[in-house]
């Protein structure tokens, strides 16, 4: 009864409906379920088609472009979970661009495990208010669900039974609104006592066994149960699974031999991207986690003693690093046997990528080269590189080679990080932001003083664009209020005064004190820091009453700390000496103001003596919030209220609808009725700047989610025929 | 022949601790849970709570939640609820029933009336 | 808590009479309600559970109904073995709550 068909991977179904038969005998889809893309297809060929025995997909179920289709009613009707193991952008179902679904139509589904809903721009797709999603997951603040047809008001969503009169369907409250609930006109959604948690229940509301997940054929019997909360083994759900059994895929027991057979098919397909599994903690999972390494006899994750070796083989001896996406492909190594080049121009949030995937990296068997990687501020990325061996060395003996690089300012903090270089030489040259001083103390720590020849470093391209300090900066008065901080230092003159043009005063918000100049940023502007630019003082010839420089930081968020560091910014000096000086980072946190207004209040009256008041914190809270403080105030009652004939025809009935606080900005636009701006009594007000803020952040927002699903669905043709799922490998 | 068996009687003083057991037989008692309703004298009954035969979870009425404590013996087939901090106001006949889906009560015990007087 | 709210809370009939009697929930319940029927000295025994159904067992004069948060227990003909005290109760949400009970005596 439990799963009665077979547990198929994930799929992807895309240009046409001759794959969608792969589903056929399909309970479990251990995996995502993609359908996208189908431009041909027509209701007809929908019509007969039926996938009753799928009851779980693990990942997500993603639609997108497929018209013809008007509802998955017939296409999955007995669909009851969706776990949301992975999810697509944080979302377990996504309906997108369906241009001729008119109801979603899923009415068994019951449960979504992890992740949200986000249904958008389907311009015929009704039956949506009808649904009632915090019965079917917990995180219903986080749907997106826009630019529908439902949105429009244009949507006569009627619930069975509601034609002749009755109120077949289950009513539940949302933002005070009683609703009937229903998936389409001829089916009600499922709704359990609420004591039946997530469980699901009988049709006479028995709660089913606390093993089940949506629904179940008995109550206490979880044989019973048509999915697990937990797991999955032998037709029954369990909480954990027993030995000799392993969890897998966070749903089901497998025993040995089947983590087993995972592992060999993997390790003698030699196809890549497949996982060798192993067993940990009792499941059975596609690798080791960090800290662990495999015993090839029985899979098992042992402790490594010390970090983990991972050798990775580059091909053809050397691996150009030129994307985030490249940079993946070496993801937990830590010995790269071979060399690596670094070229990379550009990106989103490159530092803490690149450390992601290059930070275990310990040692480099060849050698290291740094080219044209103009978004590069530090190789502080390669947090663990401990160790360029240069068995292969760049043309002209080079273990170490950094070319071109317009922004690099530092190589690593050589004050916490150790290099040992044992054979070729360093190559620096056009990098005009590294000061000498840097490269000399890297000749230093890494042991290849003195094997470098004249030409290796060049003088007159490395530093010479760079401030390149040597003197320290004190702070020497510094005081806060909520929104503006006011700093002074001492003063600094290089040896020609006149070589002072200014200071630049870098700040940002830091809540850990655990800042340093270069980790995280890059070129492209992630993680950067604000820079002020101040004049240099009027100077003394009294250098007792030297005025101190400082600056007034404004608009800044009250109970915010920053981190700030102040430095000089000189003329190049004709000697090749470059003088300056640099403060240390300090850590400055502004005053506590008052909060700004409690956000979406909702007051609902639930008897004749009470209302209840329901308000989310502010979005500013500009301190410790400790308390909040409720005014009320008793109204006269209206006297029209008491002339009124109440048996006069016509009469409407009061509308006591507000709008919701959680809705969409478009639903809330098209809940602002016509006839109001027609009648010209009323025009709407001018946007306030927060509201303008809102909206770009959400058109970001839909921009950024729109990227995402066309980076992930639209992929190149493969030449080969492919066989089956993109990804037959258990996902 | 399904029947729930309840302890005798019980005289307590302001302050003490009561502990009621209630034995199953004629059905397999981790396949459903033991609910837990008192009843004081002239009253309607009141719910205290519910505890799992296949887990021991339990869910107490908030009104109890400090002062009650339920428990299962599998291996005897028996339920037990402990009231502690007895007040005269717990006087009641206090009753287990067996739960079908959660809240189905559909068989019940005798019943233990549970005296607190000074 | 969910209040329930029973009516009458005595109600006086003779057997062959109709006898109707309404529980009213303080929020909605949706179908979630159950009546029981307690005779003195004895437990609770089940009569009707989801408003409607009949537990087994349960004569079909017995029948329950709804109206928004409002429900009744009808006897279409009470019978010398009906008397006693009806309770409704509440599973929509803990905690679980009971009417406080009528009772139906002889007249």
């Known amino acids: 009864h439990l799963y009665p068909g077979e547990v198929c991977p994930g799929m992807d179904i895309r240009n046409n409906l001759t794959r969608l038969h792969e589903l056929e005998n399909c309970s479990v889809i251990e995996g995502h379920l993609q359908i996208l893309l189908m431009f041909k297809t027509r209701p007809e060929d929908f019509r007969d088609l039926s996938f009753p025995k799928l009851i779980m997909i693990t990942d997500y179920l993603l639609l997108f472009r497929v018209y013809g289709l008007e509802s998955l009613k017939d296409l999955f009707p007995n669909l009851t979970v969706i776990r949301g193991s992975r999810l697509f952008f944080n979302y377990a179902l996504v309906i997108f661009e369906m241009v001729h679904l008119k109801e979603l139509g899923l009415y068994n589904l019951m449960n979504i495990t992890r992740g949200s809903v986000r249904i958008e721009k389907n311009n015929e797709l009704c039956y949506l208010a009808t649904i009632d999603w915090s019965r079917i997951l917990d995180s219903v603040e986080d749907n997106y669900i826009v630019l529908n047809k439902d949105d429009n008001e244009e949507c006569g969503d009627i619930c069975p039974g509601t034609a002749k009169g009755k109120t077949n369907c289950p009513a539940t409250v949302i933002n005070g609104q009683f609703v009937e609930r229903c998936w389409t006109h001829s089916h009600c959604q499922k709704v359990c006592p609420t004591i039946c948690k997530s469980h699901g229940c009988t049709a006479e509301g028995l709660c089913c066994h606390s093993e089940c997940l949506g629904n179940c054929s008995q109550p206490d019997d979880p044989t019973k149960c048509v999915a697990c909360r937990n797991f999955y083994l032998d037709g029954r759900c369990v909480e954990t699974c027993p030995p000799p059994y392993y969890h897998f895929q966070d749903w089901r027991c497998v025993n040995f031999s089947f983590c087993q057979d995972l592992h060999h098919k993997c390790k003698n397909s030699r196809r890549q991207g497949c996982h060798q599994y192993v067993i940990h903690n009792n499941k059975c999972i596609p690798e080791c986690p960090s800290g662990y390494t495999m015993n090839s006899s029985n899979l098992l994750c042992t402790p490594c003693l010390g970090p983990c070796p991972k050798v990775c083989h580059l091909l053809e001896g050397e691996k150009t690093i030129d994307s985030v996406t490249s940079a993946q492909e070496l993801r937990g190594c830590t010995v790269i046997n071979g060399s690596l080049i670094i070229n990379i121009r550009g990106g989103n949030n490159l530092a803490a990528e690149l450390e992601a995937n290059l930070g275990l990296i310990e040692e480099i068997s060849g050698y290291l080269k740094i080219r044209r990687s103009y978004a590069l501020v530090s190789l502080s990325f390669f947090r663990k590189l401990r160790l360029i061996r240069g068995e292969t060395l760049e043309i002209g003996n080079y273990s170490f080679y950094a070319l071109d690089n317009q922004n690099l300012r530092q190589l690593w903090d050589w004050s916490k990080h150790n290099l040992t270089i044992t054979q070729g030489k360093l190559f620096f040259h056009y990098n005009p932001k590294l000061c000498l001083s840097e490269i000399h103390k890297m000749e230093e720590v890494s042991g290849t003083k003195g094997r470098q020849e004249r030409n290796d470093i060049a003088l007159k391209t490395n530093g010479d664009q760079a401030s390149c300090e040597n003197e320290l900066l004190k702070f020497s008065y510094i005081r806060t209020s909520f929104d503006k901080i006011l700093l002074r230092w001492e003063p600094y003159w290089p040896p020609d005064f006149r070589d002072l043009l200014g200071f630049m005063l870098f700040y940002k918000e830091a809540p850990y004190q655990n800042v340093t100049e270069f980790d995280g940023q890059d070129a492209c502007g992630s993680n950067s820091w604000t820079v002020v630019d101040i004049d240099p003082p009027l100077r003394s010839n009294d250098p007792k009453s030297q005025n101190h420089p400082g600056w007034l930081m404004r608009g800044l968020k009250p109970w915010t700390q920053y981190a700030i560091f102040v430095k000089t910014l000189v003329t190049f000096s004709d000697e090749r000496r470059t003088y300056g000086a640099k403060s240390d980072i300090i850590y400055v946190q502004t005053d506590a103001t008052n909060p700004s207004v409690p956000l979406d209040p909702i007051s609902v009256s639930n008897s004749s003596s009470q209302i209840i008041l329901k308000w989310k914190p502010p979005s500013d809270p500009n301190g410790n919030i400790t308390h909040y403080l409720v005014f009320w105030e008793r109204q006269a009652e209206d006297s029209e209220l008491f002339e009124l004939d109440y048996c006069l025809k016509g009469l409407k009935l009061p509308s006591r609808t507000w709008s919701p606080p959680f809705e969409s900005e478009d639903s809330q636009k098209h809940n602002q009725s016509e006839y109001e701006d027609s009648a010209g009594e009323c025009c709407s007000c001018p946007k306030t700047d927060s509201q303008i803020l809102k909206e770009l952040e959400e058109s970001s927002f839909r921009k950024t989610f729109e990227d995402y699903l066309h980076n992930v669905v639209f992929v190149p043709r493969k030449t080969s025929s492919g066989t089956g799922a993109e990804d037959p490998r258990p996902s | 022949q399904m029947q729930l068996v309840q302890s005798g009687a019980e005289m307590k003083k302001p302050g003490a601790s009561v502990k009621v057991s209630c034995k199953a037989s004629?059905?397999?008692?981790?396949?459903?849970?033991i609910t837990w309703v008192r009843q004081a004298p002239g009253q309607g009954p009141e719910w205290m709570g519910w505890?799992?035969?296949?887990?021991?979870?339990?869910n107490y009425a908030q009104k109890f939640q400090d002062r009650v404590t339920m428990t299962t013996d599998t291996s005897t087939s028996t339920a037990y609820m402990e009231l502690r901090s007895l007040k005269s106001d717990d006087t009641a006949v206090y009753f287990c029933?067996?739960?079908?889906?959660?809240?189905?009560?559909?068989?019940w015990g005798q019943g233990t009336l549970v005296t607190v007087s000074s | 808590a969910i209040r329930m709210t029973q009516s009458p809370s005595t109600l006086s009939a003779s057997v062959g009479d109709r006898v109707t009697i309404t529980c009213r929930a303080s929020?909605?319940?949706?179908?979630?309600l159950a009546w029981y029927q307690q005779k003195p000295g004895k437990a609770p025994k089940l009569l009707i559970y989801?408003?409607?159904t009949l537990e087994s067992g349960v004569p079909s004069r017995f029948s329950g109904s709804r109206s928004g948060t409002e429900f009744t227990l009808t006897i279409s003909s009470l019978q010398p073995d009906d008397f006693a005290t009806y309770y409704c109760?509440?599973?929509?949400?803990?905690?679980?709550?009971f009417g406080g009970g009528t009772k139906v005596e002889i007249k």
């Open positions: 004629g059905y397999s008692f981790s396949d459903y849970g």
């Open positions: 109760q509440q599973y929509n949400s803990y905690p679980l709550t």
């Open positions: 029933a067996r739960a079908r889906g959660v809240w189905m009560f559909d068989n």
């Open positions: 989801t408003t409607s």
């Open positions: 505890i799992s035969g296949y887990n021991g979870n339990t």
């Open positions: 929020q909605s319940i949706s179908t979630w």
